[in-house]
Interface confidence: low
């Protein structure tokens, strides 16, 4: 039977941080400034991500790994790998197309990002409002009116402001 020819690709010897340079008989050349290769055997190096304008460098680009960006103060990351920076608002506000706007009555936002959410409706759980809500804080639900008979415990722990497992970024 005829043996299949197995010629090893010379580029496979080029480690991360280099590229297989076709202009120089496929020798392994180091990635030029402002570029990187994160795996071996690459024929080109990738241009480093530029953290410009509202983006700021969180991790410097090296010959083997891309730069990582975050956002300058007053902005926060959105998207995979911080692909976008979105303007922060104050607590009690949400970002609209026209900028930061105060939460409408009956809603709150306790973060610098995200949207205003409705206050918890205590009556749905048969509870009463112990502490009124504000633009920045949810209401605190207390015991139901029936629980406030003499001798009853005066306060139950407030319901969590967020769904379990959800935490600010």
């Amino acid at each position: 039977f005829e043996r299949t020819r197995s010629l090893q690709d010379p580029c496979s010897n080029c480690p991360a941080g280099t590229f297989c340079d076709n202009n120089r008989n496929q020798i392994c050349s180091p990635c030029p400034p402002n570029s990187f290769s994160s795996a071996g055997g690459q024929r080109t190096c990738d241009i480093c991500r530029q953290c410009k304008g509202v983006f700021r460098t969180r991790k410097e680009c090296s010959s083997t790994s891309n730069a990582e960006c975050d956002c300058t103060p007053g902005f926060h990351c959105l998207g995979a790998g911080c692909s976008m920076c979105e303007q922060d608002c104050k607590q009690g506000q949400e970002l609209t197309k026209k900028g930061c706007k105060d939460c409408c009555f009956g809603t709150f936002n306790d973060q610098k990002r995200g949207i205003c959410r409705p206050w918890t409706n205590c009556s749905l759980d048969g509870k009463s409002v112990l502490v009124n809500g504000t633009k920045e804080r949810d209401v605190v639900c207390g015991p139901s009116p029936a629980d406030l008979s003499p001798g009853a415990s005066s306060v139950t722990p407030p319901a969590p402001a967020r769904e379990p497992g959800h935490s600010p970024q």
Partner: antibody, heavy 121, light 111 residues
Framework: QVQLQQPESELVRPGGSVKLSCKAS????????MDWVKQRHGQGLEWIGN????????NYAEKFKSKATLTVDTSSSTAYMHLSSLTSEDSAVYYC??????????????WGQGTLVTVSA | DIVLTQSPASLPVSLGQRATISCRAS??????????MHWYQQKPGQPPKLLIK???NLESGVPARFSGSGSGTDFTLNIHPVEEEDTATYYC?????????FGGGTKLEIE
């Protein structure tokens, strides 16, 4: 070696416009940000903006957003800055300067000799 | 925008003495890794020349009598010993964010 060639001078009428050139050589033009800096006679340095030739992406200082437009011609490795609605305040030396790379922040390593723009009737 | 305030505006120094130029930023331009502050020298009729990058790193070919220090908001350029050819204007510049800005300049004169 890296070289940035700029014309020595340009004379322009008030209200007119001018397109300054900066021809780069000695490096891969598309891989480095090119910046422009203004210096009025006897004054300090003002950063105008920069352009990344590979993508054409630009940044401008607020003051120059309606004054300067940065472009490149990658086939000739030349950066351009178009200045419009010129007044005597625009009379200055304009430098092109190439950034050196380190992560996302840069120093201005290589400078052209500058073009003196004179706005005069 | 980040404002860079240089002092003094003018600095007369005797040959062989130490020249110290200060640059103060209106906000921090440093991370734990780097300070994004650079120093340039400009002689009359010439473009600026990079001397010090990232606060303290001497650019290739620049004499060792130039040194830079500082982090956060306060940075210093030192020249010692001062030589005749050091007569020039010196500028600090940050690259922390867009827009980059320069200090107002310090004119060094040999007295």
């Amino acid at each position: 070696q890296v070289q940035l060639q700029q014309p020595e001078s340009e004379l322009v009428r008030p209200g007119g416009s001018v397109k300054l050139s900066c021809k780069a050589s000695g490096y891969t033009f598309t891989s480095y940000w090119m910046d422009w800096v203004k210096q009025r006679h006897g004054q300090g340095l003002e950063w105008i903006g920069n352009i990344y030739p590979d993508s054409g992406g630009t940044n401008y200082a607020e003051k120059f957003k309606s004054k300067a437009t940065l472009t490149v011609d990658t086939s000739s490795s030349t950066a351009y800055m178009h200045l419009s609605s010129l007044t005597s305040e625009d009379s200055a030396v304009y430098y092109c300067t190439r950034e050196e790379a380190l992560g996302g922040y840069y120093e201005l390593t290589y400078w052209g000799q500058g073009t003196l723009v004179t706005v005069s009737a | 925008d980040i404002v860079l305030t240089q002092s003094p505006a003018s600095l007369p120094v005797s040959l062989g003495q130490r020249a110290t130029i200060s640059c103060r930023a209106s906000q921090s331009v440093s991370t734990s890794s780097y300070s994004y502050m650079h120093w340039y020298q400009q002689k009359p009729g010439q473009p600026p020349k990079l001397l010090i990058k990232y606060a303290s790193n001497l650019e290739s070919g620049v004499p060792a009598r130039f040194s830079g220090s500082g982090s956060g908001t306060d940075f210093t350029l030192n020249i010692h010993p001062v030589e005749e050819e050091d007569t020039a204007t010196y500028y600090c510049q940050h690259s922390w964010e867009i827009p980059y800005t320069f200090g107002g300049g310090t004119k060094l004169e040999i007295e």
